[in-house]
């Protein structure tokens, strides 16, 4: 229904802590370099306005939309140009076109610093002091560096986050608390980062009926026995809320999925058996508990697929009549009926089945022609459960660092033209995979295995398109998002690429390394690799790996030497020199 | 492919009317978004108003907000534009355009893979 003032009714269903929140959230995507204090000060200024127009709707621009009110705000703000750029030529539009290209300049990969945890001792005092500047300062440093994460999910994040210090700050050992537990978090929220962004780009460049493909089959995989009509409702609906945080309306997003999680909840008797245990919570982990729950129990007594879909005579009169509901009951039925494949694989055979059906419904014997399809989609099956099965072999092999290595040699050998940086990143995101499907149950890895990949390539795709340097990426990332993983994967080593010349400096180390955390270490070791390989894209696994032992070997005996500078400035160009003639 | 044919453009007074309308042939089950946009001599195409074929959900530039209303008549596969109270800063091309996909970016004409030939609004007195 309409509302006299769209501010004042958001204020009410979110309620004050969560509308500041999300209006933080909105700031801070937006305009990414803003202070906390800079944007914590409109997101008064917002409130302030809002409990005005909830005590009088009536009152001036009161009536405006939120996106008018928030694009005035952000466009009042001083030196707007100096700090972005053209961004700011966005103020001389109107709204909606004004919204609509501040989206267009958020930046996926913003030149802020990496976000530092402080040390437990510190970080308790400054959360005991303020809890909600503290937890407002999480907001925002999450939001500036990741500009799609979803809103509602990231006030969930901070709840968790809160839960934790309040916990751990309280313990004697607040160190070994804290750390386990705030990791845990950092890891889930990367990953929920990548996996929305992956859903803004389906509707980016795609729009919402890919989008709302996808959801009907991920929505099938968990609720089997939901009927059809229930599915496309969900569909509908998640396409909707999706649709808003994309869109940057943070508000509505987050009220709109709280009033699906609210459905849900009131409908578990035609949606799934599993969701009482994520009712009975309040509502961020509610809504949260929702969107992982387990799959439901598959019903016993379902069809062969083919009954419907191959078998009937009425196929092509059927597929004529309504192509989307009759493509999208396809979907469902065969959805329900594999939650052991990925998202991307079951759309892949959604988008065969309507080729074939294309093709087959104008010729003259339909049934002669479509007969065969379901036989047609073994080898579509077959790539990703053998792109699992030799993964996660190399993997338990290997080990998570090892297998990143594998992953970034095999990726700078396609694209060599890609940055290091950008390299590096994408290995060791691609090798977290194996930690985190390849020990999971048999049937549980492939959807795992091949709908994290995509989210991490569709990063990949992201960072490339904005100084695009391989032809092979460019192709990969210009088809359709679900034949992405497949193309990546097919992709073999760039026969145009012209090699590197060996810059003795881009090998050269120094002692400091020795004191660096571990991660930082792999990375300084990973970047030395990707250069190895872009010197020589043919080198074979088995001198990489006399190298890369080498170079171990060299860090371990200087950062135990006493004088590790010395140590550095001469066994340095020796390991240059051996490195130089083992890839000869 | 889908086909629009725009028509009911012309010369009219400020604070006058006019109704454009916009044939659609073809899949035209496809356009799941249709929108108007207007280009102005020397200036760049602009939005103007877009529907939601399946839902009719509608959104407006703020400056035609409350003059002008967008509509669609899904038996005659017809999209519609009321223009009310028109300004000389009206002046310009209209343009029927059609999105299949429903793109998250309604503003942006390169979402529209499907666009009429245009039909002018003149406003002057």
């Known amino acids: 229904e309409a509302h006299k003032s769209e501010i004042a009714h958001r204020y009410n269903d979110l309620g004050e802590q969560h509308f500041k929140g999300l209006v933080l959230i909105a700031f801070s995507q937006y305009l990414q370099k803003c202070s906390y204090d800079e944007h914590a000060k409109l997101v008064q200024e917002v409130t302030d306005f809002a409990k005005t127009c909830v005590a009088d709707e009536s009152a001036a621009n009161c009536d405006k939309s939120l996106h008018t009110l928030f694009g005035d705000k952000l466009c009042a703000i001083p030196n707007l140009r100096e700090n972005y750029g053209e961004l700011a030529d966005c103020c001389t539009k109107q709204e909606p076109e004004r919204n609509e290209c501040f989206l267009q300049h958020k930046d996926d990969n913003p030149s802020l610093p990496p976000f530092e945890r402080p040390e437990a001792e510190a970080m308790c005092t400054s959360f005991k002091e303020n809890p909600t500047t503290f937890m407002g300062h999480y907001l925002h440093e999450v939001a500036r560096r990741h500009p799609y994460f979803y809103a509602p999910e990231l006030l969930y994040y901070a709840e968790q986050y809160n839960e934790i210090l309040t916990q751990c700050c309280a313990e004697a050992d607040k160190e070994s608390c804290l750390t386990p537990k705030l990791d845990g978090v950092k890891e889930k929220a990367l990953v929920s980062s990548v996996r929305q962004r992956m859903k803004c780009s389906s509707m980016q460049k795609f729009g919402e009926r890919a989008f709302k493909a996808w959801a009907v089959a991920r929505l099938s995989q968990t609720f089997p026995n939901a009927d059809f009509a229930e599915i496309t409702k969900l569909a509908t609906d998640l396409t909707k809320v999706n649709k808003e945080c994309c869109h940057g309306d943070l508000l509505e997003c987050a009220d709109d999925r709280a009033e699906l999680a609210k459905y849900m909840c009131e409908n578990q008797a035609t949606i799934s058996s599993k969701l009482q245990t994520c009712c009975d919570k309040p509502l961020l982990k509610k809504a949260h508990c929702l969107s992982e729950v387990e799959h439901d129990t598959m019903p016993a007594d379902l069809p062969a697929i083919a009954a419907d879909f191959v078998e009937d005579q009425e196929v092509c009169k059927n597929y004529a009549e309504a192509k989307d509901v009759f493509l999208g009951t396809f979907l469902y039925e065969y959805s329900r009926r594999h939650p052991d494949y990925s998202v991307s694989l079951l759309l892949r055979l959604a988008k065969k089945y309507e080729a074939t059906l294309e093709k087959c419904c104008a010729e003259a014997n339909p049934p002669a022609c479509y007969g065969t399809v379901l036989a047609e989609f073994q080898p579509l099956v077959e790539e990703p459960k053998n792109l699992v099965k030799t993964n996660c072999d190399l993997y338990e092999k290997l080990g998570e660092y090892g297998f990143q290595n594998a992953i970034l040699v095999r990726y700078t050998q396609k694209a060599p033209q890609v940055s290091t940086p950008t390299l590096v990143e994408a290995a060791r995101n691609l090798g977290r995979v194996g930690t985190k499907c390849c020990t999971l149950p048999e049937d549980q890895r492939l959807p795992c295995v091949e709908d994290y990949l995509s989210a991490i390539l569709n990063r990949v795709c992201l960072l490339h398109e904005k100084t695009p340097v391989s032809e092979h990426v460019t192709k990969c990332c210009s088809g359709s998002l679900v034949e992405r993983r497949p193309c990546f994967s097919a992709l073999t080593v760039d026969e145009t690429y012209v090699p590197k010349e060996f810059k003795a400096e881009t090998f050269t180390f120094h002692s400091d390394i020795c004191t660096l955390p571990e991660k930082e270490k792999q990375i300084k070791k990973q970047t030395a690799l990707a250069e190895l390989v872009k010197h020589k894209p043919k080198a074979t696994a088995e001198q990489l790996k006399t190298v890369m032992d080498d170079f171990a070997q060299f860090l371990d005996t200087c950062c135990k030497a006493a004088d590790k500078d010395t140590c550095f400035s001469t066994e340095g160009p020796n390991l240059v020199t051996r490195c130089k003639d083992a890839l000869a | 492919e889908v086909q629009l044919v725009e028509s009911g453009g012309g010369l009219v007074q400020p604070g006058g009317s006019l109704r454009l309308s916009c044939a659609a042939s073809?899949?035209?089950?496809?356009?799941?978004?249709m929108g108007w946009f207007r280009q102005a001599p020397g200036k760049e195409r602009e939005f103007v108003s877009a529907?939601?074929?399946?839902?009719?959900?509608?959104v407006y530039l703020d400056s035609v907000k409350g003059r002008f209303t967008i509509s669609r008549d899904n038996a005659k596969n017809t999209l519609y534009l009321q223009m009310n109270s028109l300004r000389a800063e009206d002046t310009a091309v209209y343009y029927c355009?059609?999105?299949?996909?429903?793109?998250?970016?309604?503003?942006?004409?390169?979402?529209?893979?499907?666009w009429g030939q245009g039909t002018q609004v003149t406003v002057s007195s």
């Open positions: 529907i939601n074929w399946s839902d009719g959900r509608t």
């Open positions: 073809g899949r035209t089950d496809s356009a799941y978004r």
């Open positions: 355009a059609a999105d299949p996909d429903s793109r998250l970016y309604y503003t942006v004409p390169q979402n529209y893979d499907y």
